[in-house]
């Protein structure tokens, strides 16, 4: 699951994982 950047109830920032694929596979060899 991807989280979005924002402020949670304990005032900690939520790291945005949205720059990375959720279930990545290896790049196809060409």
């Amino acid at each position: 699951s991807e989280t979005t950047t924002g402020t949670s109830s304990n005032s900690s920032q939520s790291t945005s994982n949205s720059g990375l694929a959720p279930n990545p596979t290896n790049a196809t060899t060409k």
């Epitope: 699951s1 920032q13 939520s14 945005s16 994982n17 990375l20 694929a21 990545p24 290896n26």
Partner: antibody
Framework: EVQFVESGGGLVQPGGSLKLSCAAS????????MDWVRQASGKGLEWVAE??????????YYAESVKGRFTISRDDSKSTVYLQMNSLKTEDTAIYYC??????WGQGTLVTVSS | DIVMTQTPLSLSVTIGQPASISCKSS???????????LNWLLQKPGQSPKRLIY???KLDPGIPDRFSGSGSETDFTLKISRVEAEDVGIYYC?????????FGGGTKVEIK
């Protein structure tokens, strides 16, 4: 304020080991996918390893160049991610950054592998 | 591995003028969920990198709107509408669609 603070770098001989730590604060660490990225002096960025969160079964991924030698782990109770580096080579010499999925970055810790 | 190729290698820009950096990937970055995991990062002199943009065009919090990202599949562009002195550094594109994550070689932006 979000802070990632790396430690554990230093000078080590080829074949030796080091364990890097990255302590996070100001961030919901348990939700973060944590990565290590390195940068040799005057060079570009190279991804090293990643560990995902509990909902993703703490799955780990590694660059081919470190697979079998480096191990990434995390302790959510301490908001800390680790990189155990074994069988170090001279080409592993670099500044090692920890980053929350490329979002927040630490200041880096220098690892020098030399005899 | 997906190879990320950035051009130009360096860029000298007058303050207030626009700047553009190109990033091309050796394979499509379009992921099966319809999203494209292309990021832009800036490493200012003596500092650690900082992400500016994720998923091609989404600005990270606190990033000025003079920065914009565009592109699809294999061709991407970072644009700065009006360069400011604080924008100097090395800009990297990075793909997060297929393992291993890979970075472009960087584009050094300096003030003319």
């Amino acid at each position: 304020e979000v802070q990632f603070v790396e430690s554990g770098g230093g000078l080590v001989q080829p074949g030796g080991s080091l364990k890097l730590s990255c302590a996070a604060s100001g961030v919901t660490f348990s939700e973060a996918w944590m990565d290590w990225v390195r940068q040799a002096s005057g060079k570009g960025l190279e991804w090293v390893a990643e560990i995902r969160d509990k909902p993703n079964s703490y799955v780990t991924y590694y660059a081919e160049s470190v697979k079998g030698r480096f191990t990434i782990s995390r302790d959510d109770s301490k908001s800390t991610v680790y990189l155990q580096m074994n069988s170090l080579k001279t080409e592993d010499t670099a500044i090692y950054y920890c980053t929350g999925a490329m979002d927040y970055w630490g200041q880096g810790t220098l690892v020098t592998v030399s005899s | 591995d997906i190879v990320m190729t950035q051009t130009p290698l360096s860029l000298s820009v007058t303050i207030g003028q626009p700047a553009s950096i190109s990033c091309k990937s050796s394979q499509s970055l379009l992921y099966s969920n319809g999203k494209t995991y292309l990021n832009w990062l800036l490493q200012k002199p003596g500092q650690s990198p900082k992400r500016l943009i994720y998923q091609v065009s989404k600005l990270d919090p606190g990033i000025p709107d003079r920065f914009s990202g565009s592109g699809s599949e294999t061709d991407f562009t970072l644009k700065i509408s009006r360069v400011e002195a604080e924008d100097v550094g090395i800009y990297y594109c990075m793909q997060g669609s297929s393992l291993p994550w890979t970075f472009g070689g960087g584009t050094k932006v300096e003030i003319k």
